[in-house]
């Protein structure tokens, strides 16, 4: 039985031509992570899996950062970088947890940053 | 140009020991994780050993079928790979590969051969 | 005896389209990334496909891949005779903690 639950840093917005972290955390589950996958859309953005670490898919490689802890740092924002981006938890013996985070890339100085947290 | 380079292979009696090398060239043993793989004459590819990136946790994986006899290791002011093999035994014989790469070995040298045999 | 299952040897006519399969549990298969690797006769290996689909640069989009429940293939249109080579599918397994090899399958060009 599945127990865990998903936190993500939810909607979020940020200026153009800035950066800003992505973040989940699992929590309420004793499930070993084995791997986390981050994506927008369907494309892969990275990878982190417990043995072989980080892969930065090669098309993000200038501008996504691995971390903190389990997050991904998107760096130099485009307006195209508005959308939904995927947090996919995979573990051990519960199966697949996935969070959702929204991104609203602004081109104006009025972006509000949504929360923020690190996995400690 | 990236590359690995093998040596230190031979003929060994069982119970006897070999320790492997592989020179790194273009790039940072240290930096990207390195494993040995081994492929007996006419069988297929095997894997033996693997070592993470110093920036991932610093791990070493084994095959249970070595666990307890080889270990790798690396110099990275040589920019070396090792795999120290002992309690040698017929089953080792084979060509060893050292390989870079963690998602997909990206790399591989051209292999060194280990006979063990009486 | 390998957890993933190839067929030991397939051929082909230059031009043609060839398939190799790569079969096992459907945790093996359906939930990690496959890698393919390529062993031209008397060479070292060649990272041929990895996470599934994804080819390094020099690999021509001959190579393709595809995977469905418990098993995967990797095909190569318009057969080449330089194609001729054992072909490897392989993973990484989270739980042995290490690298899992088909047994090969030998592809010969006729």
């Known amino acids: 039985m599945m127990t865990g639950t998903i936190e993500t840093t939810g909607n979020i917005s940020a200026e153009k031509g800035g950066s800003i972290i992505l973040q989940c955390h699992l929590s309420s589950t004793t499930a070993q992570v084995t791997q986390v996958n981050w994506e927008q859309q369907d494309q892969l953005l990275a990878i982190c899996n417990a043995d072989l670490g980080w892969h930065i898919s090669p098309s993000f490689k200038d501008r996504v950062a691995p971390g903190p802890g389990l997050g991904l740092t998107l760096q130099s924002l485009t307006v195209n970088d508005t959308g939904e981006y995927f947090c996919i938890y995979h573990t051990y013996p519960d199966g697949t947890y996935t969070g959702r985070i929204f991104l609203e890339v602004l081109e104006s100085s009025v972006a509000e940053h949504g929360a923020r947290f690190q996995i400690p | 140009e990236v590359q690995l380079l093998e040596s230190g292979g031979g003929l060994v009696q069982p119970g006897g020991s070999l320790r492997l090398s592989c020179a790194a060239s273009g790039f940072t043993v240290s930096d990207h994780y390195m494993s040995w793989v081994r492929q007996a004459p006419g069988k297929g590819l095997e894997w033996v050993s693997t070592?993470?990136?110093?920036?991932?946790?610093?791990?070493?994986y084994y095959a249970d079928s070595v666990k307890g006899r080889f270990s790798i290791s690396r110099d990275n002011s040589e920019n070396t790979l090792y795999l120290q093999m002992n309690g040698l035994r017929a089953e080792d014989t084979a060509v060893y590969y050292c390989?870079?790469?963690?998602?997909?070995?990206?790399?591989w040298g051209q292999g060194t051969t280990v006979t063990v045999s009486s | 005896q390998s957890v993933l299952t190839q067929p030991p040897s397939a051929s082909g006519t230059p031009g043609q389209r060839v398939t190799i399969s790569c079969s096992g549990s459907n945790f093996n298969i359906g939930t990690k990334y496959l890698y393919w690797y390529q062993q031209l006769p008397g060479t070292a290996p060649k990272l041929l496909i990895y996470l599934d689909s994804q080819r390094p640069s020099g690999v021509p989009d001959r190579f393709s891949t595809s995977k469905s429940g418990t098993s995967a293939s990797l095909a190569i249109s318009g057969l080449q005779s330089e194609d001729e080579a054992d072909y490897y599918c392989a993973l990484w397994d989270d739980h042995l903690h290490g690298w899992v090899f088909g047994g090969g399958t030998k592809l010969t060009v006729l």
């Open positions: 070592t993470s990136s110093t920036s991932w946790k610093n791990y070493t």
């Open positions: 390989a870079k790469g963690s998602y997909g070995m990206d790399v």
